[in-house]
């Protein structure tokens, strides 16, 4: 895909990182078995994947979380894949929702999001969750990536 | 993607197969509506997809299982996508976890894993689960595949 | 991917649409942040993605639904990705199943399906669910797409 100097491969896969920040935006790191094909895609501030070239991208995220119905709010756990483009409104690209488990102390569940979207130069994608403290950061459980078609 | 003789398409999609083996590694078959683009990717011993060319691959697996909280161990059902490369450490690429259902006799749930990874020539990927006897093998429920970027 | 006039990119991502129809086939629309690369892939009758060119495609669907164990049938909620090719039998490519939640009035859950399949010219793919009335149509919750390798 995208062979040659004119058309290099563009792909990224980053790994979740626990964060003391109270923000709902998940944090990521280039660690473990990560992928960062070249500088045409970058991880910025540990929170968003930013692309330099316009085009169609398959973007995905996986979030594993552990929650309990009694200890959580009534609302389900929601993971959102969001887009921020220069000079445009932020928007939700994809969302997934899972009702909290009745298992104690908490029940693990995994969410997978993925889709094809047009990104502009300088566009960034990031992942929001309703409660970051419930996210599982064990090897392989929570990750985020993209590939340019 | 990978057009021409120099750059053939490389892709595979294989279908789950019930197994009497006690191993936690899932078994697969080239049956039903499967995909095997050419001999640059092969299904070995019915358990792993092995690639001949180095490069970035999008690798995915879907596992549907049926389990019951009372009849299962306390630990959740976990599906792991694992990598084995000649002369390198085996490692977990992706994992997903789902707590067992309280439905009787068992409750079905589906897990989807997917991500972009660099594979070396001769590298193999395979899928591990905590309890293979709980996996659903009905048409389309459990599958495994990859595509070279 | 598929660069140049001979080999244009082919990709689609469509958004779920609530429907008064009683059919189990989900309805989709080119609305919101949708993708339709060109006329080599089309959304027909709001229900199926149809391709003009033979080849390998990565096809995916995500379905979020809200259901309750007591109010639903015993059977789980099942989402199926199906294929219809000219002059051939329809067939199931992928399925996922989730047991209904015990949460009241209903518990949300998300399903993700995806795989690589060979499509013939004129082939159509569509998504079936056991109960369309349970599907969530909020922004980003339910979508369907493909990309040609």
């Amino acid at each position: 895909m995208q062979k040659g100097d004119q058309n290099p491969q563009i792909a990224a896969h980053v790994i979740s990182e626990a964060s003391s920040k109270t923000t709902s935006v998940l944090q990521w790191a280039e660690k473990g078995y990560y992928t960062m094909s070249n500088n045409l895609v970058t991880l910025e501030n540990g929170k968003q994947l930013t692309v330099k070239r316009q085009g169609l991208y398959y973007i995905y995220a996986q979030v594993t979380f552990c929650s309990n119905r009694e200890a959580s709010s009534q609302a389900p756990f929601i993971a959102s894949l969001c887009l921020k483009s220069p000079g445009r409104f932020e928007r939700i690209l994809l969302r997934a929702a899972n009702t909290h488990s009745s298992a104690k102390p908490c029940g693990q569940q995994s969410i997978h999001l993925g889709g094809v979207f047009e990104l502009q130069p300088g566009a960034s994608v990031f992942v929001n969750v309703t409660d970051p403290s419930q996210v599982s950061h064990g090897t392989g459980f929570t990750s985020f990536g993209l590939l340019k078609l | 993607m990978q057009k021409g003789d120099q750059n053939p398409q490389i892709a595979a999609h294989v279908i789950s197969e019930a197994s009497s083996k006690t191993t936690s590694v899932l078994q697969w078959a080239e049956k039903g509506y499967y995909t095997m683009s050419n001999n640059l990717v092969t299904l070995e011993n019915g358990k792993q997809l092995t690639v001949k060319r180095q490069g970035l691959y999008y690798i995915y697996a879907q596992v549907t299982f049926c389990s019951n909280r009372e009849a299962s161990s306390q630990a959740p059902f976990i599906a792991s996508l694992c990598l084995k490369s000649p002369g390198r450490f085996e490692r977990i690429l992706l994992r997903a976890a789902n707590t067992h259902s309280s439905a009787k006799p068992c409750g079905q749930q589906s897990i989807h894993l997917g991500g972009v990874f660099e594979l070396q020539p001769g590298a193999s990927v395979f899928v591990n689960v905590t309890d293979p006897s709980q996996v659903s093998h009905g048409t389309g429920f459990t599958s495994f595949g990859l595509l070279k970027l | 991917m598929q660069k140049g006039d001979q080999n244009p990119q082919i990709a689609a991502h469509v958004i779920s649409e609530a429907s008064s129809k009683t059919t189990s086939v989900l309805q989709w629309a080119e609305k919101g942040y949708y993708t339709m690369s060109n006329n080599l892939v089309t959304l027909e009758n709001g229900k199926q993605l149809t391709v003009k060119r033979q080849g390998l495609y990565y096809i995916y669907a995500q379905v979020t639904f809200c259901s309750n164990r007591e109010a639903s049938s015993q059977a789980p909620f099942i989402a199926s990705l199906c294929l219809k090719s000219p002059g051939r039998f329809e067939r199931i490519l992928l399925r996922a199943a989730n047991t209904h939640s015990s949460a009241k009035p209903c518990g949300q859950q998300s399903i993700h399906l995806g795989g690589v399949f060979e499509l013939q010219p004129g082939a159509s793919v569509f998504v079936n669910v056991t109960d369309p009335s349970q599907v969530s149509h909020g922004t980003g919750f339910t979508s369907f797409g493909l990309l040609k390798l």
């Epitope: 790994i15 660690k31 473990g32 950061h137 090897t139 | 390198r88 450490f89 490692r91 | -």
Partner: nanobody
Framework: EVQLVESGGGLVQPGGSLRLSCAAS????????MGWFRQAPGKEREFVAA????????YYADSVKGRFTISADNSKNTAYLQMNSLKPEDTAVYYC???????????????WGQGTLVTVSS
């Protein structure tokens, strides 16, 4: 310069235990993945176990799962392989290895010890 020195091998009866050590020097131990391979006479070198720097998670080959335990002591720059319920088929030269991802070359760099022989026989 990266150096890995194994110790702890020897002769043990079936069902017995051994603990292998791998003393590392010349690199930031905590930021490298550490692991063990083995090579039986006339066979290819095979993976046994690894412990990863991203949170210390361990991974085992199916053949040793439940019997072997890998661990690391960052303060001593040493990795260990505790081998229990040993079988004759565990007889091999055991090699310690380190794996570090080189961000410049975008590739894994492996370093190897000289190996220590484990013989399981009655």
């Amino acid at each position: 310069e990266v150096q890995l020195v194994e110790s702890g091998g020897g002769l043990v009866q079936p069902g017995g235990s051994l603990r292998l050590s791998c003393a590392a020097s010349g690199f930031g131990f905590g930021s490298y993945d550490m692991g063990w391979f083995r090579q039986a006479p006339g066979k290819e070198r095979e993976f046994v176990a690894a412990i990863y720097s991203d949170g210390g998670s361990a991974y085992y080959a199916d053949s040793v799962k439940g019997r072997f335990t890998i661990s690391a002591d960052n303060s001593k720059n040493t990795a260990y392989l505790q081998m229990n319920s040993l079988k004759p088929e565990d007889t091999a030269v055991y090699y310690c290895a380190s794996d570090h991802y080189d961000t410049d070359t975008k590739s894994d760099v492996y370093n190897w010890g000289q190996g220590t022989l484990v013989t399981v026989s009655s």
